[in-house]
């Protein structure tokens, strides 16, 4: 029962997370105009991964897509790639996890197959979440770097001229959506991996031994009850799970930087 709940909750959390990653990727507000120097601007600029927008006081909003591919910064391309990889892995993970759900019966699928599918989807969710977190963090780092560079230019590169005010950009809503969504997908993936341990049918480690008492013939099977709990020592399943954990650790080496302006 606890395993089913863990698996179901992992699936739901991952589903929410992936929906968030998709939303963040599509959002236009990855970076928004910093209003510190001009809080009463009548023209507000904001940018996404795919287009940049301008919203006027009049209510008129104009968005222009980045129609060039080669002219875009390599970092932006990298962030796009990370987010798309995250979405694709997450979508495949969701598809796999639907069939792996214990509450859903598909033909005569064995529990061991469901356990493997649960683990696979869990790992996919973990990598998906890490891709999203890495993508958002790379973009945030890029913003912080550009912010301080433009601040330095504002005060040192003017040469006495104060006619042009350089537009500085700060963190947009999409970054926070991305971080939270990536985190949820990661958590969902971990929950799926945990659920996998309890899903696999246990092999008993001891053969049934017959003990002959005087005048009575009773067959006592140690490990019989233990096997049904799902938490017994199972080297085969443990090996699979450890492999998954190792993959998780490897993927977690992605750079993650949360700099607030």
């Amino acid at each position: 029962m606890a395993v089913t709940a863990c698996q179901g909750l992992g699936f739901v959390v991952s589903l929410i997370g992936i929906a968030g990653i998709i939303a963040a990727t599509c959002m236009d507000q990855w970076s928004t105009q910093d209003l510190y120097n001009n809080p009463v601007t009548a023209v507000f600029n904001y940018q996404g991964l795919w287009r940049s927008c301008v919203r006027e006081s009049s209510g008129f909003t104009e968005c222009r897509g980045y129609f060039t591919l080669l002219g875009l910064p390599a970092m932006l391309q990298a962030v796009r790639a990370l987010m798309i990889v995250g979405i694709v892995l997450g979508a495949i993970g969701l598809l796999v996890s639907i069939f792996a759900l214990k509450c859903i019966r598909i033909g005569s699928m064995e529990d061991s197959a469901k356990a493997n599918m649960t683990l696979t989807s869990g790992i996919m969710f973990i990598v998906s979440g890490l891709c999203a977190i890495a993508g958002v963090s790379v973009f945030a780092n890029m913003l912080v770097t550009n912010f301080w560079m433009s601040t330095a230019n504002m005060y040192t590169g003017m040469g006495g001229m104060v006619q042009t005010v350089q537009t500085r950009y700060t963190f947009g809503a999409a970054l926070f959506v991305g971080w939270v969504a990536g985190g949820l997908t990661l958590i969902g993936g971990v929950m799926m991996c945990i659920a996998c341990r309890g899903l696999a049918p246990e092999e008993t480690n001891y053969k049934a031994v017959s003990y002959h008492a005087s005048g009575h013939s009773v067959a006592y099977k140690p490990g019989g009850f233990k096997a049904s709990t799902g938490f017994g020592s199972n080297t085969k399943n443990k090996k699979i799970y450890d492999g998954g954990a190792r993959t998780e650790d490897e993927v977690q080496s992605y750079p993650s930087k949360h700099d607030y302006v």
């Epitope: 601007t41 009548a42 301008v54 006027e56 006081s57 009049s58 008129f60 042009t164 537009t167």
Partner: antibody, heavy 118, light 113 residues
Framework: EVQLLESGGGLVQPGGSLRLSCAAS????????MSWVRQAPGKGLEWVAT????????YYADSVKGRFTISRDNSKNTLYLQMNSLRAEDTAVYYC???????????WGQGTLVTVSS | DIVMTQSPDSLAVSLGERATINCKSS????????????LSWYQQKPGQPPKLLIY???TRESGVPDRFSGSGSGTDFTLTISSLQAEDVAVYYC?????????FGQGTKLEIK
Amino acid sequence: EVQLLESGGGLVQPGGSLRLSCAASGFTFSSYTMSWVRQAPGKGLEWVATIIIGGSYTYYADSVKGRFTISRDNSKNTLYLQMNSLRAEDTAVYYCTRLVKGNAMDYWGQGTLVTVSS
Amino acid sequence: DIVMTQSPDSLAVSLGERATINCKSSQSLLNSGNQKNYLSWYQQKPGQPPKLLIYWASTRESGVPDRFSGSGSGTDFTLTISSLQAEDVAVYYCQNDYSYPFTFGQGTKLEIK
């Protein structure tokens, strides 16, 4: 046809109050940012205040800040300008305007004259 | 605040001739996000409210004759009337639409020579 009709102007003593209204018709009032612009007799144009579409943001000229309040009633298609602590220098024709692309003012009312004098 | 300065204060041009009015802003009105200049031009005839001629520094408002054109970028802008007509006699104002407070130039009075 777009129409903006100001009312509420008149003669008022210094320190007094007045409320200007602007009745809008011929367009979806709630979908536009609106402004008040004034023109002192024989002088140039001076922007007074702006209220954004939803009414959540308002902006004022430094000369009227703290004394004037811009508001709108989208259900009545009406823009207001509450003027308190009036001064002689507030004497002007007050125009109600609609903001469009480029934050430009494409339609202007005929104006209402406010005279502050003792 | 952005200060708008128009020149000349008054201008007399013969009918059919070109009229040029300049407007200078104390800060750039060019928005980097869309590469548009937030400046508009208005025409005001005696006893009438102002009329929008140009927005985004060079985009003509619908219904405005094509003899009116706007140009310039950053801090320097120009309104040009290619062939002056009698009905063009008015006061012309430029306006900063980029940041609050919105500010107008002092106006240029255009007359027929």
